[in-house]
C-alpha cells in the first residue's frame, strides 16, 4: 500500500465564489474515497466534480475532486480522504 499525497488548492471562480480542488496523487491500490465536507458533513455528488482515477506512470494513481464555495466560508470546508483503511482531513488554504 502506498498512501496518497493530498494537496488542496483554490482558484477564483465567479464573483464572490472560489473553486477549491483537492488532489490525491501517488497512491496504490487504486480504490480511494475523496469528497468535500461542509461543517463535517459530506456534500452531495451533484455539487462536486470528480476527476477519473488515472495511472500517473509510476505504478501509482492520481485523482481529484472540486467544488465551488462562497469566499469567506473557506474554514467550513474540508477535503476528506479515505484509502486502504486510513483517512485524513485537509483544510482549504487561506
Amino acid at each position: 500500500t502506498v498512501p496518497p499525497m493530498v494537496n488542496v488548492t483554490r482558484s477564483e471562480a465567479s464573483e464572490g465564489n472560489i473553486t477549491v480542488t483537492c488532489r490525491a496523487s501517488s497512491f496504490y491500490p487504486r480504490n480511494i474515497a475523496l469528497t468535500w465536507r461542509q461543517d463535517g458533513v459530506s456534500l452531495s455528488h451533484d455539487t462536486q466534480q470528480w476527476g477519473d482515477v488515472l495511472p500517473d506512470g509510476n505504478g501509482t494513481y492520481q485523482t481529484w475532486v472540486a467544488t465551488r464555495i462562497c469566499r469567506g466560508e473557506e474554514q467550513r470546508f474540508t477535503c476528506y480522504m479515505e484509502h486502504s483503511g486510513n483517512h485524513s482531513t485537509h483544510p482549504v488554504p487561506s
Epitope: 469528497t35 461542509q38 461543517d39 463535517g40 458533513v41 459530506s42 456534500l43 452531495s44 455539487t47 474554514q75 467550513r76 474540508t78 483517512h87 485524513s88 482531513t89 485537509h90 483544510p91
Partner: antibody, heavy 122, light 112 residues
Framework: QGQMQQSGAELVKPGASVKLSCKTS????????ISWLKQKPGQSLEWIAW????????SYNQKFTAKAQLTVDTSSSTAYMQFSSLTTEDSAIYYC???????????????WGQGTLVTVSA | DVLMTQTPLSLPVSLGDQASLSCRSS???????????LEWYLQKPGQSPKLLIY???NRFSGVPDRFSGSGSGTDFTLKISRVEAEDLGVYYC?????????FGGGTKVEIK
Amino acid sequence: QGQMQQSGAELVKPGASVKLSCKTSGFTFSDNYISWLKQKPGQSLEWIAWIYAGTGGTSYNQKFTAKAQLTVDTSSSTAYMQFSSLTTEDSAIYYCARHDYYGTSGAWFAYWGQGTLVTVSA
Amino acid sequence: DVLMTQTPLSLPVSLGDQASLSCRSSQNIVHINGNTYLEWYLQKPGQSPKLLIYKVSNRFSGVPDRFSGSGSGTDFTLKISRVEAEDLGVYYCFQGSHVPWTFGGGTKVEIK
C-alpha cells in the same frame, strides 16, 4: 461513545475573560468536531461555534465571533473556549458537545459534557 | 437566521398517553446536500440535553422505539407513543442545515 469532562463553575467580574475546558477520552480526538453551546437559566440553547480537532479549523455563529475563541490541545485531547469582555448577559451554562458524522448522515450534538456554570457579577 | 418555533410551550400528559410535539422552521431546512438535518433533544432538570432523533426520523442509539420523528420542509413532529416517567422534561428541536444552527424554544412535557 467516550466521555467529555468540563471544568468547574466560574464566578467572574464584568469585563474579565474566562477559559473553559472540555477534556475528552474514549475516542479519537483528532477525528472529531466539537461544538460549544450556551444556555441561560430557564431558556433554550444557542450554538456558539465548532472546532475540528484534526486541523483546528473553526466556524462561529456570527453573534459570538467577537466574544468566543475556540482552541484545542491534541496532546491532552482537550477543547477550550475563551470567552472575553464578559457581561451579565454571558451568565449561563456552557456545554461542549461532540458531533457524530457518517458522511451525509450522523448527528450534530451526539455526546455532551456536563456543562460549566459561568456567573458574571460585580 | 432560521427561527424554530415549538408548540405547545407546555404539554401536560398522563403516563401511558401519546404525546405529540410540533416544530416549525421559518424556512425550508434542506441542506445543500439534500438532507434535512432536523434533530430532537430531551433535557431533564439539572442534566445536559440528550439526542433522541437525528435527520428527522432516525432514532439515536439507545433511544426507545416509543419515540418517532416525522415531517419535511418546514413542519416537523415528535411523537411519544406511551409516555413514561423518564420522558418528562423539556424537548428541543434543532436545525443543522443552515448556519447559524438554531434551536426551538422548547416544549415542557409534564404530568397532568
